[in-house]
Interface confidence: low
């Protein structure tokens, strides 16, 4: 792992990448897509201890004000940074139709 | 109120946006920051529940594996979807300058 | 419609407590946090805090933190705000008003309010 | 606490005039303010929210602008029921506070 990217809590257990095998019924998706039938979803998962991945001033305020205030401000957390785009073939009344949907599955993940 | 906003949980508990006051010192800012000596710090905080202020396709999928696999996928998380500019006065070597970050308080807030 | 209706005109002596009503109809009651405020002529409007109706949740201003106490009973769908320790500068129209779902400290409907006066 | 002084306190005009009240803050709010009005005898109603957003009912002769510290109410086109007391709120944290008011009165 970069110097970085070091997680305090123990190996895998900081915010990064997973990736979720999930079918259109767990996605709620049946009725509107045909393909693919099954997703694997990658999405940002873990822990977000102090400043470890810290996405900007704000994610360092949000730290520093959580140590402070634990029941108040909560600590900041995992969510996408950047996201892959990914094509569905869709059931429209006339047939099927293509459509890319650029902000479905996390590229990279950092703390917020 | 809209109705896309309606939170479930009660008023005031879903993700929106909170202001702290916060000093210097509470930041860590004391040794590098002179003015404002007080910061009302915007952020985000509160519950994400199902679709309520969905940033994007990702944070509907993620609702519907939290709802699947809640030990393994975590809810959506409460963050910025904007910010606002905040100036400040900084020590220099050299005396002061004023440093413009746009990254600081957010402006507004959605599910992630 | 939203309505919010206040009870009457009280008339307290100074280190007395007034408990003002403010009944809620229109709208689900848990729905919306329940705010208060006051009007007098010499400090104008002011904020005493806010209540969350659901789990009863309160947000005082640090000026009345210590006298103020606000409450409700959703079984009545009515709101209450107890000033305890009255002074003559208490003397003012208290307002009990919603406050918009995603804004804190927005009030959307008021009371009609209840006169105070605070005299010996 | 936040500050809000708004100007003029008091001002005179015709049906029909254009008219706008102004409000500073004491420090940066954004657009986290909100414009009431408010008659004798009655309950402040609530005009325009996040310095120009039009609350429901209200007609489109009220507008509301600026951001940070500096703010406006104008009304285009001044009504007979238009005359009463402006004030301007923050909403920018705990605890929200208030304009003194401008009283608008027939000239």
């Known amino acids: 792992a970069r110097n970085g990217d070091d997680c305090p809590l123990g190996p895998g257990r900081c915010c990064r990448l997973h990736t979720v095998r999930a079918s259109l019924e767990d996605l709620g998706w049946a009725d509107w897509v045909l393909s693919p039938r099954e997703v694997q979803v990658t999405m940002c998962i873990g822990a977000c201890p102090s400043q470890f991945r810290a996405a900007n001033m704000h994610a360092q305020i949000k730290t520093s004000l959580h140590r402070l205030k634990p029941d108040t401000v909560p600590a900041p957390c995992c969510v996408p940074a950047s996201y892959n785009p990914m094509v569905l073939i869709q059931k429209t009344d006339t047939g099927v139709s293509l459509q890319t949907y650029d902000d479905l599955l996390a590229k990279d993940c950092h703390c917020i | 109120a809209r109705n896309g906003d309606d939170c479930p949980l009660g008023p005031g508990r879903c993700c929106r946006l909170h202001t702290v006051r916060a000093s210097l010192e509470d930041l860590g800012w004391a040794d590098w920051v002179l003015s404002p000596r007080e910061v009302q710090v915007t952020m985000c905080i509160g519950a994400c529940p199902s679709q309520f202020r969905a940033a994007n396709m990702h944070a509907q999928i993620k609702t519907s594996l939290h709802r699947l696999k809640p030990d393994t996928v975590p809810a959506p998380c409460c963050v910025p979807a904007s910010y606002n500019p905040m100036v400040l006065i900084q020590k220099t070597d050299t005396g002061v300058s004023l440093q413009t970050y746009d990254d600081l308080l957010a402006k507004d807030c959605h599910c992630i | 419609q939203v309505q919010l209706v206040q009870s009457g005109s009280e008339l307290k002596k100074p280190g007395a407590s007034v408990k003002v009503s403010c009944k809620a109809s229109?709208?689900?009651?848990?729905?919306?946090?329940m705010d208060w405020i006051r009007q007098s002529p010499g400090k104008g409007l002011e904020w005493i805090g806010d209540?969350?109706?659901?789990?009863?949740?309160?947000f005082y201003n640090q000026k009345f933190k210590d006298r103020a106490t606000l409450t409700v009973d959703k079984s009545t769908s009515t709101a209450y705000m107890e000033l305890r320790s009255l002074r003559s500068d208490d003397t003012a129209v208290y307002y009990c008003?919603?406050?918009?779902?995603?804004?804190?400290?927005?009030?959307?409907?008021w009371g009609q309010g209840t006169t105070v006066t605070v005299s010996s | 606490d936040i500050q809000m002084t708004q100007s003029p306190s008091s001002l005179s005009a015709s049906v029909g005039d254009r008219v706008t009240i102004t409000c500073r803050a004491s420090?940066?709010?954004?657009?986290?303010l909100a414009w009431y009005q408010q008659k004798p005898g009655k309950a402040p109603k609530l005009l325009v929210y996040?310095?120009?957003t039009l609350a429901e009912g209200v007609p489109s002769r009220f507008s509301g602008s600026g951001s940070g510290i500096d703010f406006t109410l104008t009304i285009s086109s001044l009504q007979p029921e238009d005359f009463a007391t402006y004030y301007c709120?923050?909403?920018?944290?705990?605890?929200?506070?208030f304009g003194q008011g401008t009283k608008l009165e027939i000239k």
């Open positions: 008003a919603r406050e918009e779902k995603l804004y804190f400290g927005l009030m959307d409907y």
């Open positions: 229109g709208y689900t009651f848990t729905d919306y946090n």
């Open positions: 209540i969350n109706p659901n789990q009863g949740g309160t």
């Open positions: 420090e940066n709010i954004y657009s986290y």
């Open positions: 996040n310095a120009k």
């Open positions: 709120q923050h909403q920018y944290g705990s605890p929200p506070t």
